[in-house]
């Protein structure tokens, strides 16, 4: 019997209301051993992977998603989950990004709500793939 | 995709989608349909350890559940409008569980009495 | 509601000449949008993903473009292997949606 994989936990540095413009960084923890971290947006199919990981503390690994400059497109519910072969873990509790106009900063360009400002680490286009030798490119893939 | 064929209204039915060369545990797995000679329609997906999100109007009627190498799609209180050709679609390419790269053939439902 | 609204329905053109379908989202969805060509008897085939990316084994000759809410499919250098039903595809929002395709342009070569 395999062992339930502990929820992941989720939470935003420097904090969950942020100035337009300003940076913010999404934390997402599990246990050792996690490959991918995956941050997720509520009601989206679209998301954030990384196998960026490093070892919080000897129980706990991390993985970190900047936006480097919020826009109020990215205010909204945010949420973590990881992969750790062979098994996904259960979602971590949402956490609500909020995005205030800044006191007299510089403009930055507005995005409207529901667009797809993610963070900026892009994850390259087989993050999706499985974590297999290269030669699994040999192999052909099938719907039947 | 099996299962398929023809069904009186009223009923339930189970199709399945088998995956070779992958595991679909890592993949967004999509279900969706296309009416005769109309366009297709988005029924829902199901990711990671049993994740799915529906269309609105198969909340309730329609269940997207897996394995490690099939995706089931149960259908219940079938209708006339339910008939047409039903697909399964892996996504995930480019960052989005809607772009579906790798598609089925697809499989006839047939609802009649 | 997100709806998808594709334009024309149907376009014939040509072998060698040039396509532009229109796809317009009513909300603004980034480069969140994909777009599909589906021949009779067989399933869709994905072409361009995040608006304007080539996927893997698509000619050249398709190519997409757009962001927020209006977005072109070009089909250049017409061939017959082209007469197909073409979707576009919001691939952002799955909470809270009818369907997440446009309703289709048939393009046929002359």
């Known amino acids: 019997q395999e062992e339930d994989l502990p929820r992941p936990s989720i939470s935003a540095e420097p904090g969950t209301v942020i100035p337009l413009g300003s940076h913010v960084t999404f934390v997402c923890r599990g246990p050792v051993g996690v490959q991918t971290f995956r941050l997720e947006r509520d009601s989206r199919s679209t998301y954030n992977d990384t196998e960026d990981v490093s070892q919080a503390s000897p129980s706990e690994s991390e993985a970190r998603f900047r936006i480097d400059s919020v826009r109020e497109g990215n205010a909204g519910l945010y949420r973590c989950i990881y992969y750790k072969p062979p098994k996904w873990s259960e979602q971590s509790d949402y956490l609500e990004l909020l995005v205030k106009e800044s006191s007299g900063g510089p403009d930055s360009p507005d995005t409207e709500p529901g667009s797809s400002a993610g963070p900026t680490q892009r994850p390259s286009d087989n993050s999706h793939n499985e974590h297999a030798p290269a030669s699994q490119g040999l192999k052909a893939e099938h719907l039947y | 995709e099996s299962g398929g064929g023809l069904i009186t209204p009223g009923g339930t039915l189970t199709l399945t989608c088998t995956a070779s060369?992958?595991?679909?545990?890592?993949?967004?797995m999509n279900w969706v349909r296309q009416a005769p000679g109309k366009g297709l329609e988005w029924i829902g997906y199901?990711?990671?350890?049993?994740k799915t999100y529906y269309a609105n109007w198969a909340k309730g009627r329609f269940t997207i559940s897996k394995t490690s190498t099939t995706v089931d799609l149960k259908m219940t209180s079938l209708t006339a409008e339910d008939t047409g050709t039903y697909f399964c679609a892996r996504g995930g390419v480019g960052n989005s569980g809607l772009n579906l790269d790798l598609w089925g053939p697809g499989t006839l439902v047939t609802i009649s009495s | 509601e997100l709806v998808l609204t594709q334009t024309p329905a149907s376009v014939s053109e040509p072998v060698g000449g040039t396509v532009t379908i229109k796809c317009q989202a009513s909300?603004?969805?980034?480069?969140?949008l994909a777009w599909y060509q589906q021949k009779p008897g067989q399933p869709p085939k994905l072409l361009i993903y995040q608006a304007s990316r080539l996927a893997s084994g698509v000619s050249s000759r398709f190519g997409g473009s757009g962001s927020g809410t209006e977005f072109t499919l070009t089909i250049s250098d017409l061939e017959c292997a082209d007469a197909a039903t073409y979707y576009c595809?919001?691939?952002?929002?799955?909470?809270?949606?009818?369907?997440?395709f446009g309703g289709g342009t048939e393009v046929v070569v002359k």
């Open positions: 060369g992958f595991t679909v545990t890592r993949y967004y």
């Open positions: 909300q603004s969805i980034g480069s969140w």
């Open positions: 199901i990711y990671a350890s049993s």
């Open positions: 595809q919001q691939a952002e929002y799955s909470g809270d949606v009818e369907n997440t």
